[in-house]
């Protein structure tokens, strides 16, 4: 049994880091493998993660962490029984993938304006809470070419757009994702999408 693709990990900079790797053949990850991780610091504790299958030869493990600070560094040991398959380290602050925003809502009751709001995925006491910016993706269910991205570079988790910038009388979907420049993070996963019917009054043309 060998590791074909070494573990790569990302942290949500809150409580979970996710590590993925591939073995050289079909593996029952949860019965055959264990990923041990330990904070490199005084009197730290070794933890064991039981991986799950992620495709035939792929494994994924969700490492629970009580808190994350920028200096944190973890040792990682991948074991198959008594055999050490791989040894490495992981610094969560250098591999951050934020949590996905939630509760995306489209408010259509404001006159000819669409107000999209969503929830910041972090509690106020988390460092990332005040450092997230967002991308909102809006697309038409009827026209695949009608696909747009709005970058929200301010902290407030909301976006206002004129309903007239979208076609009237058709259904649209929206989703949102987050990233944090301060840690040069990757983008989060997209939030679940939400659907609405776009309709607005055409401006009266005077001749």
């Amino acid at each position: 049994m060998k590791v074909l693709q070494e573990p790569t990990c990302v942290s949500d900079y809150m409580s979970i880091s996710t590590c993925e790797w591939k073995m050289n053949g079909p593996t029952n990850c949860s019965t055959e493998l264990r990923l041990l991780y330990q904070l490199v610091f005084l009197l730290s504790e070794a933890h064991t993660c039981i991986p799950e299958n992620n495709g035939g030869a792929g494994c994924v493990c969700h490492l629970l962490m009580d808190d994350v600070v920028s200096a944190d560094n973890y040792t990682l040991d991948l074991w198959a029984g008594q055999q050490l398959l791989w040894k490495g380290s992981f610094k969560p602050s250098e591999h951050v993938k934020p949590r996905a925003p939630g509760n995306l809502t489209v408010h259509t009751n404001v006159s000819d304006t669409l107000l999209l709001t969503w929830s910041n995925p972090y509690p106020p006491d988390n460092y990332l809470y005040n450092h997230l910016t967002y991308a909102v993706n809006i697309w038409s269910e009827n026209d695949p070419a009608d696909f747009r991205i709005y970058n929200v570079t301010y902290l407030e988790p909301s976006l206002r757009i004129a309903a007239s910038t979208l076609k009237s009388g058709i259904s649209y979907r929206a989703r949102v994702r987050a990233w944090a420049q301060c840690y040069n993070t990757t983008w989060s996963e997209w939030s679940p999408s939400t659907k609405w019917h776009n309709s607005y009054r055409e401006p009266f043309e005077q001749h």
Partner: antibody, heavy 119, light 107 residues
Amino acid sequence: QVQLKQSGAELVKPGASVKMSCKASVNTFTGYNMHWVKQTPGQGLEWIGGLHPGNGDTSYNQKFKGKATLTADKSSNTAYMQLSSLTSEDSAVYYCALTTAGRAWFAYWGQGTLVTVSA
Amino acid sequence: DIQMTQSTSSLSASLGDRVTISCRASQDISNYLNWYQQKPDGTVKLLIYYTSRLHSGVPSRFSGSGSGTDYSLTISNLEQEDIATYFCQQGNTLPWTFGGGTKLEIK
């Protein structure tokens, strides 16, 4: 809410030993470290050392090696510190303080145990 | 050992004031700087850890900042219950060491 309950004040003679306790109201004691801190008017706060109750690992301030011995009883979520060969210099308030395992900040503190060394 | 210096041993301020308490380390401590509050009855509480992280349950009027060797604790709107002695502590290098404390009093 985590609470640390320390044993009561001690009046001891020079040359004697004293053992104080600190009981933690936590679910899994083994996920924490228990540290001890000395406070005197002259020296202020001094870190004595810490213990991982799960595996018994300890770390001591060199200044207190041979003076303090840290132990724990996992079954009762209780940590102990024994001070030996007491002198008047050991008269102080001693605090137990809890950190999450491997952390350098004392998240919760006991109320303190006053030790007075006097003939 | 790393020396932690709180140059102001006592400080008088009025209720509602913005108060800043400073702490200097004798060498770089890489943000491993924590702040504690000790009430007159001896009760000690963690306020700020790792330079600027607010410990759970601590009012948001407390904040911390700094880097390298220089750090500070700020109380943005002083309240009566904040009357206490404040200690800094470094957790970067063994043995962990504390500052001498800054006693905060009401004018």
